[in-house]
Structures are given as C-alpha cells and as structure tokens.
Interface confidence: low
Amino acid sequence: HTAAQDNCTCPTNKMTVCSPDGPGGRCQCRALGSGMAVDCSTLTSKCLLLKARMSAPKNARTLVRPSEHALVDNDGLYDPDCDPEGRFKARQCNQTSVCWCVNSVGVRRTDKGDLSLRCDELVRTHHILIDLRHRPTAGAFNHSDLDAELRRLFRERYRLHPKFVAAVHYEQPTIQIELRQNTSQKAAGDVDIGDAAYYFERDIKGESLFQGRGGLDLRVRGEPLQVERTLIYYLDEIPPKFSMKRLT
C-alpha cells in the first residue's frame, strides 16, 4: 500500500487509522467503522466510506438531496454491510429487520421488505449522471475548456480513466457529467465510477475525503467554478424493481 511512510497517513482516505504495523514495519491503514485494510494508492470504496462516516460523530452527517428523477439516493445515509472486498452487499438491513436491495453504489433499488427479502446479485450501476448548477459568472464557460478541466479533475484527483467520462454537457448554468462503466469495461485496478462520483460529491460539498489536501479548487481558465447544487442520477445494468405505488 502507498500510505505515506513518513507520518503514516492515508493520502486518499482521511477516515482511517494508520500505524506502522504492516510487513517490515510498513504503514498500514484501516477504515474506521469496519477496520478493513485499505489501499491508500487509490480511492476507498463507497461502502467502506459510508460505514466510516456512520461511525463518526452525528453532527458530521448530511443527507443527499432527494429528487424525483430516475434512481436517486433518496434514503440518505445508512450503516451499510460491505463484503470482504469492500463492496456493498446486495441486501442491506437495518436494526429493525427492514431489508432492501441496493446497486453497486449502495442506492436502494427495490421496495423495503423483511428478512425474507432476497437480493440475488449486486446489480452494477453502469451510468452515473452528475448534474451541477454553477453560481453566476461574468459569462458562460467555454465548453471545451470546461470539458477538459473536468476530465483532468477526474483523471488526476480521482484516478478515473478518461474513457469512463462519457460526456460533459453544458448549458449555462447547468453542467452534466456522464460517467459510464460496464462490468466488461472495468479492468482490475480501475477506479469504479461510483467511488469517483462519491469522492466528487463530497469534494463539491466541501467535505473532502483526501488527507491533508486543500478543498476542491475548480477553475476553468482561471475562473472559479463554484457549484451551488448537485443532483446525482444512477442507472443500473438491470432496471430497478419498485412497486407501482412508489412510482405514482
């Protein structure tokens, strides 16, 4: 792992406890909440981050903004069950034995049920739409410059391969970033679009998950890009299964 050796911290996840007790006295970091070892050379999975967040003080919590569109995280935060790889388990339950199925980004994709509810597989979220509204500026941003800057951000800050940034649309003041990553496209070592989107969402809210880095300072040709609202839509490889009651 690439945890910073000198002061033994995790550059990509500040919600960790690190100590030099790895092989050969190497720095090893474990996620808060789960105690799972994390690879500090890449992004930590969203499941482990949510679990760590739920173990943090209550006043650190914020809810994800709800929306009526597509599959959106209307449920906000919960304490998830993660598998040994740090991915969300397909079935999630709360302390009152209410259960539901989630997709690979941990968003509920079925009605809530009881302990008898079956979730046969973890369905992959292969398309994420990040809708941003920026604060008023002197003029519209140049689309090409904006596109290049956002691709650079996802590549350099979140280590997401540019081929997974399918498009950047812009109609002032709305910016839409499309992330696409099918199961077949994701190679070993590739950052997951769900994890990149989550880090980006937290950065936009001023709640950076990176250790010791300044907050996100987004600029397009020197002009600050300040986001005033964010909505994230998730599209799964298999459509979600909700009762008609929820859809009305």
Epitope: D147, A148, R151, R152, R155, H161, P162, K163, F164, V165, A166, A167, E178, R180
Partner: antibody, heavy 121, light 107 residues
Amino acid sequence: EVQLLESGGGLVQPGGSLRLSCAASGFTFSNYWMNWVRQAPGKGLEWIGRIDPNDSETHYNQKFKDRVTISVDKSKNQFSLKLSSVTAADTAVYYCARSGFGSTYWFFDVWGQGTTVTVSS
Amino acid sequence: ETTLTQSPAFMSATPGDKVNISCKASQDVSTAVAWYLQKPGQSPQLLIYSASYRYTGVPDRFSGSGSGTDFTLTISSLQAEDVAVYYCQQHYSTPLTFGQGTRLEIK
C-alpha cells in the same frame, strides 16, 4: 492552437509497409482517442482504427485488423500508423483525427491536413 | 457493422434554397450521428454531432435532426461557399462508419 500534423506519406512498394506519424499540439493528448481515417481518390471516408494514449488500448476496423498497428509515444504527443502488405487499393489520403472518450463523443472534431500515400511499383 | 446510406448522392441547388440531405442507418444508432463537410482539397470539417448539436463556430443555417435510423442534415439557406461533399458518420459503435457522401453543387 489545436493542431494535428501528419507525416510520412509518399510512394510505397506493393507488398511493403506504410508508416505514418501524427503530432498533436494545443490540447491535452490523453483526453482523446486518436484515430486514423483514410480516403481513396474520389472515394468516401474510411475509419482504420484508434488508440487511447493513456494505456495504448487500440480498436481496429476488422477490415484492416491483420495488417494494422497503431502505436503512441505519449512523451512526444505523437501517434503512428503502420499498415503492412499494402496493395494499390491502399492508395489514399490518410488523416489523423481526434475523438472524445465515450460514444457520445466518438466523432472527429479535429483533423490533420492529410498525407498522401501512393502504392505503386 | 452499421452501414450508412446517404441520399441523394449528388444534388444541385440555387443560393437561398433549403437543402435536405438524408442518412439512413442499417441499425439503430440512437442519436449518435455526426455530419461533416469536405471542400475540394481540404480535410473534413465537423458540422453537427449527436444528431442535432451544432459544433462550435458552425453557422446556424446548418441543422441536424433524427434518431434511431433516419437522420437529416438541413441547410436552411444555401450559400455559395457551401459547395462541398457532405458525409454522415455514426458514433454509436465501432467500427465507426461513414455514409458514401453527398456532393452538393450550386446551379
């Protein structure tokens, strides 16, 4: 200024190989697929293939698959086309062109000026 | 492989005319179609992408429409400088393919 500049065209013997280069400038090379497209005299446009400068992933038109190689030198912002076992049917203007990642952007917004290859003995 | 068929192959029109060029895909390509013009001795130039989005700097007399398999490029008021060969291209799947071209001349 965003620019693509091809080089290496000229006369090639039948059965030989053509090698072309394309130098990119004025944009972030690693944000785009880099493509080769050709146009035979008086004919339409034909896509040969493309390369991702980040990891050298290539996609080729099946028509050329067995005799085409596209490679990249990221440090020089340059990519190349090698087409082997050429025949007179490979006589064409060869263009390099960029396209974005994600099929939403698989169109060609910047083209080189083209380099002419003539296959003849 | 998706085949694109353009019609007409050749057309002649008068300055000021409205011109339509058709492009039909052999299979559904959603809205992933681009249009280019190519003037004699020059490289192709992008006009329209994603069926209806005008590329930066393209005059607004050029517009595109369609989805699925049927697409149209429209020049609302033909100018003398629009003499060129026009190509459609699908950017839905590889191999990326082009129509055979439509040669547009001024009467």
